[in-house]
């Protein structure tokens, strides 16, 4: 039982439990397809334990394999709206450093108003993740409809 | 190597590995939009390790950040059916205690017959999660089409 | 701090952190609905740490509860294409050993071109997971559109 107590006394960071769940803050200016995120207990149920936000983009602080997940819902949307404005596409990728730039996850809305997915991917300290929403529809800012998060899984 | 052995001898509960995967039991009576869940090895591949069921709703036993995931498929459904019966919406939230009531995850079916998503969220011991399906279509009870689960991720 | 160092010196396998993320290699011959997967750092961001590939199918090496996730996008697809070719269905299941054969996860495309989902399920050493895509449309081989993975969660 002493081990369990010892484990609990260790800083969680030493166990590599980096995790973040973000809510949408705002969209970018016209030529910028990026979504800008925010997180923290003052905002509701979003949080950052390890990763940080850099101008609304998520920056990784620990090397490892991460589960990345996202849900985005389009605002004031019906299947007619979604199909009329096709293609509306969401892509999650490493946007910085430029040498590691790559698309990790990509989905189109087609006749739906919500996309949701997740994947495992290796990320390195300093990687910044960007979420690009292309199209002419706005994402919902409701915290139960649009969110983005990562969870460290293993080294 | 002694540490690895010692770790394996510890009860998993002390490591905080609470996890549950549930299958649909039944829908509620007419004015009750909640889905009622069941779990346990006798039922197939569903299980509860830590969390408990309280009248078909999932109750959390350990504070922490959880990954909550759900998939719901509508019974005898086509894209025509789904669009005709729009809005059919699924919401996952904390429904008890009332002081912590909040919607965590919300999706509409639009022209699709399945929704699936996941998110990280802080949950506290005693939180009860409810899954509300609003609309006039039945959820499939097939265990590979409709399921709901949580996984403790970190304190 | 010595404990954290000791923990890092332990082989990760002893902690049970089996994980894999795969990318699509190819589809099967006409009468074989299975998708054939590949993984490894030489291929990009896919990997296998613990599980192995057996003729393009994922074989589990450690008993436990796993998070299984998948995303499949249909190639050269629009909502019209998808609805015209309905039913196009993806099923993930244990296909070997035959005594444990079962469908774990099933989704239809309806009017969409991407499905994505995840679930928790017990898996045993030697279980082989197959992903069956039925229909007349090809899956995209783009690594950010089609992927399949598992993550060991607890014993």
């Amino acid at each position: 039982q002493r081990f369990a107590q010892a484990q609990q006394q260790l800083p969680l960071e030493s166990l590599g439990w980096d995790v973040a769940e973000l809510q949408l803050n705002h969209t970018g200016p016209q030529q910028d397809p990026r979504l800008y995120w925010q997180g923290g207990p003052a905002l509701g149920r979003s949080f950052l334990h390890g990763p940080e936000l850099d101008k609304g983009q998520l920056r990784i602080h620990r090397d490892g394999i991460y589960m990345v997940h996202i849900q985005v819902t389009l605002a004031i949307c019906s299947s007619t709206t979604a199909s009329r404005h096709h293609p509306t596409t969401l892509a999650v990728g490493i946007c910085s450093p430029a040498s590691r730039s790559i698309s990790l996850l990509r989905l189109s809305f087609h006749q739906g108003c919500t996309i949701a997915s997740q994947r495992l991917t290796p990320l390195a300290r300093g990687d910044t993740l960007c979420t690009n929403l292309t199209g002419t529809l706005l994402p919902s800012r409701n915290t139960d409809e649009t969110f983005f998060g990562v969870q460290w899984v293993r080294p | 190597q002694r540490f690895a052995q010692a770790q394996q001898q510890l009860p998993l509960e002390s490591l905080g590995w609470d996890v549950a995967e549930l299958q649909l039991n039944h829908t509620g009576p007419q004015q009750d939009p909640r889905l009622y869940w069941q779990g346990g090895p006798a039922l197939g591949r569903s299980f509860l390790h830590g969390p408990e069921l309280d009248k078909g709703q999932l109750r959390i036993h350990r504070d922490g950040i959880y990954m909550v995931h759900i998939q719901v498929t509508l019974a005898i459904c086509s894209s025509t059916t789904a669009s005709r019966h729009h809005p059919t919406t699924l919401a996952v939230g904390i429904c008890s205690p009332a002081s912590r009531s909040i919607s965590l995850l919300r999706l509409s079916f639009h022209q699709g017959c399945t929704i699936a998503s996941q998110r990280l969220t802080p949950l506290a011991r005693g939180d009860t999660l409810c899954t509300n399906l609003t609309g006039t279509l039945l959820p499939s009870r097939n265990t590979d089409e409709t399921f709901f689960g949580v996984q403790w991720v970190r304190p | 701090q010595r404990f954290a160092q000791a923990q890092q010196q332990l082989p990760l396998e002893s902690l049970g952190w089996d994980v894999a993320e795969l990318q699509l290699n190819h589809t099967g011959p006409q009468q074989d609905p299975r998708l054939y997967w590949q993984g490894g750092p030489a291929l990009g961001r896919s990997f296998l740490h613990g599980p192995e590939l057996d003729k393009g199918q994922l074989r589990i090496h450690r008993d436990g509860i796993y998070m299984v996730h998948i995303q499949v996008t249909l190639a050269i697809c629009s909502s019209t294409t998808a609805s015209r070719h309905h039913p196009t269905t993806l099923a993930v299941g244990i296909c070997s050993p035959a005594s444990r054969s079962i469908s774990l996860l099933r989704l239809s495309f309806h009017q969409g071109c991407t499905i994505a989902s995840q679930r928790l399920t017990p898996l045993a050493r030697g279980d082989t997971l197959c992903t069956n895509l039925t229909g007349t449309l090809l899956p995209s081989r783009n690594t950010d559109e089609t992927f399949f993975g598992v993550q060991w969660v607890r014993p």
């Epitope: - | 649909l24 007419q30 498929t73 019974a75 005898i76 025509t80 005709r84 019966h85 006039t136 279509l137 039945l138 499939s140 009870r141 097939n142 265990t143 089409e145 | -």
Partner: antibody, heavy 120, light 111 residues
Framework: EVQLVQSGAEVKKPGSSVKVSCKAS????????MHWVRQAPGQGLEWMGA????????SYNQNFKGRVTLTADKSTSTAYMELSSLRSEDTAVYYC?????????????WGQGTLVTVSS | DIVMTQSPDSLAVSLGERATINCRAS??????????MHWYQQKPGQPPKLLIY???NLESGVPDRFSGSGSGTDFTLTISSLQAEDVAVYYC?????????FGQGTKLEIK
């Protein structure tokens, strides 16, 4: 509780058409399929078709080979069934029916029935 | 179309005794974990009345002496203790696909 009130009995000549109405109480009319079922004297029940009032989409029993037309007026919460090219074997009680909660084809609510007699 | 066949065509049971009516579908009416089979009671000059939906669910207001069972293609309606007011014609019906079809009916009388 939903009530379905149908129009009165009709006597029609062979080859003519009949149009039966079904007025629904309550505000759920657009959200549920309205089905039509008929029953010939001393016989069993036969499903004719259904209309979804929300968008006017219809499904028909092919046994009626295009003789049935279903329509709905959301503004008055009324569904209509028109049967053309009438013959003597169309003499039956015609019912409108719908589900109460789930919109699948089992029927909690029924109209009182409309007797249509086809006779020369 | 799915053909529904009821047996027997008619049935005479003593008051207080059990009555059993069977219905067979020409193919399975089960899907998505449900059996899309329903039972109705019809008395002369009245529309049918829903008794049981989805094979075994008792409709609100229906006495609990009525019960339904079965799955796949074979289904049963049981009246545990026949009452005088149960004299009627009983129909099974599926809603697994379009068109929904009814059985030919079973006439239940008192012996």
């Amino acid at each position: 509780e939903v009530q379905l009130v149908q129009s009165g009995a009709e006597v029609k000549k062979p080859g003519s058409s009949v149009k039966v109405s079904c007025k629904a109480s309550g505000d759920t009319f657009p959200r549920y399929n309205m089905h039509w079922v008929r029953q010939a004297p001393g016989q069993g029940l036969e499903w004719m078709g259904a209309i979804f009032p929300g968008n006017g989409e219809t499904s028909y029993n092919q046994n009626f080979k295009g003789r049935v037309t279903l329509t709905a007026d959301k503004s008055t919460s009324t569904a209509y069934m028109e049967l053309s090219s009438l013959r003597s074997e169309d003499t039956a009680v015609y019912y409108c029916a719908r589900n109460s909660y789930y919109d699948y084809a089992w029927f909690t609510y029924w109209g009182q029935g409309t007797l249509v007699t086809v006779s020369s | 179309d799915i053909v529904m066949t009821q047996s027997p065509d008619s049935l005479a049971v003593s008051l207080g005794e059990r009555a059993t009516i069977n219905c067979r579908a020409s193919k399975s009416v089960s899907s998505s974990g449900y059996s899309f089979m329903h039972w109705y009671q019809q008395k002369p000059g009245q529309p049918p009345k829903l008794l049981i939906y989805l094979a075994s669910n008792l409709e609100s207001g229906v006495p609990d002496r009525f019960s339904g069972s079965g799955s796949g293609t074979d289904f049963t309606l049981t009246i545990s203790s026949l009452q005088a007011e149960d004299v009627a014609v009983y129909y099974c019906q599926h809603s697994r696909e379009f068109p929904p079809t009814f059985g030919q009916g079973t006439k239940l009388e008192i012996k």
